[in-house]
Amino acid sequence: EEELQIIQPDKSVSVAAGESAILHCTITSLFPVGPIQWFRGAGPARVLIYNQRQGPFPRVTTVSETTKRENMDFSISISNITPADAGTYYCIKFRKGSPDTEFKSGAGTELSVRAKPS
């Protein structure tokens, strides 16, 4: 079976304050079984932004229908962006288990926030 790759095509994304940011992430294989999670930052203190299996995440929506078994697009949209949302976002595949374990990470997308146009 094909080795899973996690593709975050955008190294950086710039969004005006108040707008929505779309962070793209696609995977190349359905295996191993397990959820995709989005985090802001790396290391122990990273913050959970989206998890298929828990929620709600009021400002985050998925771009495609992630509940479909064959779905490989795990892009997210974050609404009403503020300067506090700036940072690097990682799309990460977990292997199903008790607990789920991290399998592979995307390279990250840096979100920068522009001042609201007057």
């Epitope: 985090f39 802001r40 930052g41 790396a42 290391g43 122990p44 203190a45 990273r46 913050v47 959970l48 932004i49 828990q54 940072g87 607990p99 789920d100 991290e102």
Partner: antibody, heavy 117, light 108 residues
Framework: DVQLVESGGGLVRPGESLRLSCAAS????????VTWVRQAPGEGLEWVSL???????YYADSVKGRFTISRDNSKSTLYLQMNGLRAEDTAVYYC???????????WGLGTLVTVSS | EIVLTQSPGTLSVSPGERATFSCRAS??????LAWYQQKPGQAPRLLIY???TRATGIPARFSGSRSGTEFTLTISSLQSEDFAVYYC??????????FGGGTKVEIK
């Protein structure tokens, strides 16, 4: 408003155990790493332990093998199980919320642990 | 482990004056340095992170700067509520997260 409330401190003898709790509210507990920091009487701050969003744990060398950090996301509560307590563990223990920048933006008021024979 | 050395240990300043104190890291931490304020009987409060970014709600009289491994916190005009102990903390990506020994700012 973010609130962190520690409990479980008290007076124990050397070698005994104690479990501290920290009840969190005002933020989505499951989404953040949380940490314990202590302060011995009249001394500075010392980082003790951290638990990540995914449950990975980290410890200061001074407590490794004796202390265990854990979290119950369903109760929005952080714990610190302290075994084999020593006199040098006497301190006020604070829990704090950790930002993605690895800084501690909200702190509890602390709970005092005294280890003395 | 990164060691942070704060100086001076105590700083005596009159209200309205400028206060400047420093924190030196034993090895490079980039700009990953934070400052906290602690008043007697209270928990620490985050003031500055990334060497010079003020935390939410922190007044503009607090500012931070960096020169290599030396970091400075400046309070431009001391208010009565600013007399406290100030700690630096390195916040590189991985533990242990170390703190400096603190600088006490007292009324002259």
């Amino acid at each position: 408003d973010v609130q962190l409330v520690e409990s479980g401190g008290g007076l124990v003898r050397p070698g005994e155990s104690l479990r501290l709790s920290c009840a969190a509210s005002g933020f989505t507990f499951t989404n953040y790493a949380v940490t314990w920091v202590r302060q011995a009487p009249g001394e500075g701050l010392e980082w003790v332990s951290l638990i990540s969003v995914t449950g990975t744990t980290y410890y200061a060398d001074s407590v490794k093998g004796r202390f265990t950090i854990s979290r119950d996301n369903s109760k929005s509560t952080l714990y610190l199980q302290m075994n084999g307590l020593r006199a040098e563990d006497t301190a006020v223990y604070y829990c704090a919320k950790v930002t993605w920048k690895n800084v501690f933006d909200y702190w509890g008021l602390g709970t005092l642990v005294t280890v003395s024979s | 482990e990164i060691v942070l050395t704060q100086s001076p240990g105590t700083l005596s300043v009159s209200p309205g004056e400028r206060a400047t104190f420093s924190c030196r890291a034993s090895q490079t931490v980039g700009s990953k340095l934070a400052w906290y304020q602690q008043k007697p009987g209270q928990a620490p409060r985050l003031l500055i992170y990334d060497a010079n970014t003020r935390a939410t709600g922190i007044p503009a009289r607090f500012s931070g700067s960096r020169s290599g491994t030396e970091f400075t916190l400046t309070i431009s005009s001391l208010q009565s509520e600013d007399f406290a102990v100030y700690y630096c903390q390195q916040h590189t990506d991985w533990p242990p997260y170390t703190f400096g020994g603190g600088t006490k700012v007292e009324i002259k």
